[in-house]
Amino acid sequence: DSSKWVFEHPETLYAWEGACVWIPCTYRALDGDLESFILFHNPEYNKNTSKFDGTRLYESTKDGKVPSEQKRVQFLGDKNKNCTLSIHPVHLNDSGQLGLRMESKTEKWMERIHLNVSERPFPPHIQLPPEIQESQEVTLTCLLNFSCYGYPIQLQWLLEGVPMRQAAVTSTSLTIKSVFTRSELKFSPQWSHHGKIVTCQLQDADGKFLSNDTVQLNVKHTPKLEIKVTPSDAIVREGDSVTMTCEVSSSNPEYTTVSWLKDGTSLKKQNTFTLNLREVTKDQSGKYCCQVSNDVGPGRSEEVFLQVQYAPEPSTVQILHSPAVEGSQVEFLCMSLANPLPTNYTWYHNGKEMQGRTEEKVHIPKILPWHAGTYSCVAENILGTGQRGPGAELDVQYPPKKVTTVIQNPMPIREGDTVTLSCNYNSSNPSVTRYEWKPHGAWEEPSLGVLKIQNVGWDNTTIACAACNSWCSWASPVALNVQYAPRDVRVRKIKPLSEIHSGNSVSLQCDFSSSHPKEVQFFWEKNGRLLGKESQLNFDSISPEDAGSYSCWVNNSIGQTASKAWTLEVLYAPRRLRVSMSPGDQVMEGKSATLTCESDANPPVSHYTWFDWNNQSLPYHSQKLRLEPVKVQHSGAYWCQGTNSVGKGRSPLSTLTVYYSPETIGRR
């Protein structure tokens, strides 16, 4: 049953004289193993014999023996699956039909395979994509319907006869579906590859040429342009003429439109291959190119930089930074459009040339107030000298300078006067906006920079002011030199150091703490009576009569100041003692008689002693001696003695007469 045999193999195999053929082949004999195999060349069925006639290239028998002449052909198969064959070498006359006669126990089959052997190696075939565009990667394929294990070959790519640098990937197929060798080359064609010949060359293992295929590249690309300019350096002066020509060196497909661009912007009404610029101005400086389009897209030429040279334009000055603070650094930049760029600069400050400053930038490392003003510059190039522009103003800011505190009053200033001071300065930038004063006080500022001190104190010594803008500058303090009457006048005892005793030498000092002016006069006074005009008041031998309330006065040209009253106390022993009797020195018996010891003493008498006419001390120690009732025998002379811390004093005798009462006389 023929349907039971299933074969798979390439339909036709290709080779050339001297090469080899490898025939991949599989089969399936469903009724059992293969028992006999014969390979025929161009088999023909003989109906008479019911057998195939033809050249037998290979024959296998049941005992597996193969005739020696059949070594050229090899059956590489097996008894149930594989029917692969190899013919090595293959000859031209091997072309035709190969017949595989297969016999199993019960079935037979003839499988036919076509073999095409050429006299010389046949060429490979180059396959190209339908369209090639510049810079787009394409894959070139070189295909050869040949591959054989016993005959190695290689495929090499050439461009215009020169091996291509790109690495090709070669693959082979020896399968029941196909037999081929293929080389694939990835390649990014440039416009310059258009029309170039690409070759795929078949070589043997030694690199010997066998055959090739060639194709001409058709690379689609935008127009390729060349721009030519007169003059060739594209450097002209204002008023000159310039011609630019656009040449198309290649375009595939043909170009359709032409235009010109300046600095990337299309120039209107310029649609020819020549651009004529007459009497150019500096504004026409720039980058020019031509643009030509085809179906692929627009192509642009290289840019031509047209330089229209001109003398420097009026310059401007840029200041970094204004306003500037005194002591900071400042940079000036001279800006002037010119072509070529200026080579020399002249700088001016307030109209005067700044010597030695010839560069685009001027640097002042430490700004001073007199750097303020207008800075201008002039730029110069080979075509001429520009004009001086308006310049830029440098504002130099600094604290108020030379600040002084000025006393507006006529001198001298007296304590209690109203003093007016002003805060003056030489210059300031920005303007002074406020003032400060030291020391602080509850003082009036009637106007900016003026200080009014009402009722100036004697101790207002110095005042300083500051004038302030963004900074404060302090003046040196000014002395008010306030004049005042002597202060803190007081009486001070110089000697003796202890209490004053009658007879002592005594000195009193008139002290004061301060006086301005310093020249002073002194006056001593007791009970409104002038005693002296020296700073000291001296007593050679003080007496109790000198005790009392003393004041001293100190005066200067401003006024006089009195001390507080000072009490002078003289200590002395009891004196001027006398015994006084009450109600009198004649008293009737039985009545009351009081004897008083009167004295003058400082300190007062602390202890009294009474004596009778016999100089007998009496047992009484108080100032008063009371006799009640008085007796006649009390009559007699009495005296007293007073004692204080200084000493003792005694009185003269005083006689008390006690007379009888009428009753006593009546009784007698």
């Epitope: 030695g356 400053r357 010839t358 640097h363 002042i364 490392p365 430490k366 007199w370």
Partner: antibody, heavy 117, light 107 residues
């Protein structure tokens, strides 16, 4: 710290030339002008010339024909060269720093030059 | 060239006193005037620039004034360390010129 230091030969023979180097530190020669000033013994100060920040020079007309000032920015040095020295060129030579609008704020210590055979 | 004239070559002043040194320019110098102090054996030292601007570190007893062509350096309360020669210099235009100097001595 700003410093200027002059180095000179000390003794020069009459009719010979004088070369002095001023080496500066603490500032750049492209930011400050350098002047040369001399002071004969017991006499006053005399300005000889200046090297401006931009590299230009200016000379006292009395010395124009025999004076040249140059500099080497990379070494921070300014050079004075004076030809045809006579005995009355004996002086202390100072290099000093200034800038536009400023006075001469820093002076070298001076180098003493004696012209004698 | 602008000529700078210092009328006094020598000045003798008492300690603590006030001294005024004058300098006259042959042309207007727009206040671009400097004063220098030179002590024996030393390089000059800048005291005042721009006619009035006191350099940092210079005692406040030094002051400058003037305008146009006439300029003054004042020292109040003279100290022993102020004994020196004082030079004026114009920095208005080249050649920069100096005054002949005023030597200050203590009386």
């Amino acid at each position: 710290e700003v410093q200027l230091e002059e180095s000179g030969p000390g003794l020069v023979a009459p009719s010979q030339s004088l070369s002095i180097t001023c080496t500066v530190s603490g500032f750049s020669l492209t930011r400050y002008d350098i002047s040369w000033i001399r002071q004969p013994p017991g006499k006053g100060l005399e300005w000889l010339g200046v090297m401006w920040t931009g590299g230009g020079t200016n000379y006292n007309s009395a010395f124009m024909s025999r004076l040249s000032i140059s500099r080497d920015n990379s070494k921070s040095q300014v050079f004075l060269k004076m030809n045809s020295l006579q005995t009355d060129d004996t002086a202390i030579y100072y290099c000093v720093r200034s800038y536009y609008g400023s006075a001469m704020d820093y002076w070298g210590q001076g180098t003493s030059v004696t012209v004698s055979s | 060239d602008i000529v700078m004239t210092q009328s006094s070559s020598y000045l003798s002043v008492s300690l603590g006193g006030r001294v005024t040194i004058t300098c006259k320019a042959s042309d207007h110098i727009n206040n671009w005037l400097a004063w220098y102090q030179q002590k024996p054996g030393n390089a000059p030292r800048l005291l005042i620039s721009g006619a009035t601007s006191l350099e940092t570190g210079v005692p406040s007893r030094f002051s400058g004034s003037g305008s146009g062509k006439d300029y003054t350096l004042s020292i109040t309360s003279l100290q022993t360390e102020d004994v020196a020669t004082y030079y004026c210099q114009q920095h208005w235009s080249t050649p920069f010129t100096f005054g002949s100097g005023t030597k200050l001595e203590i009386k």
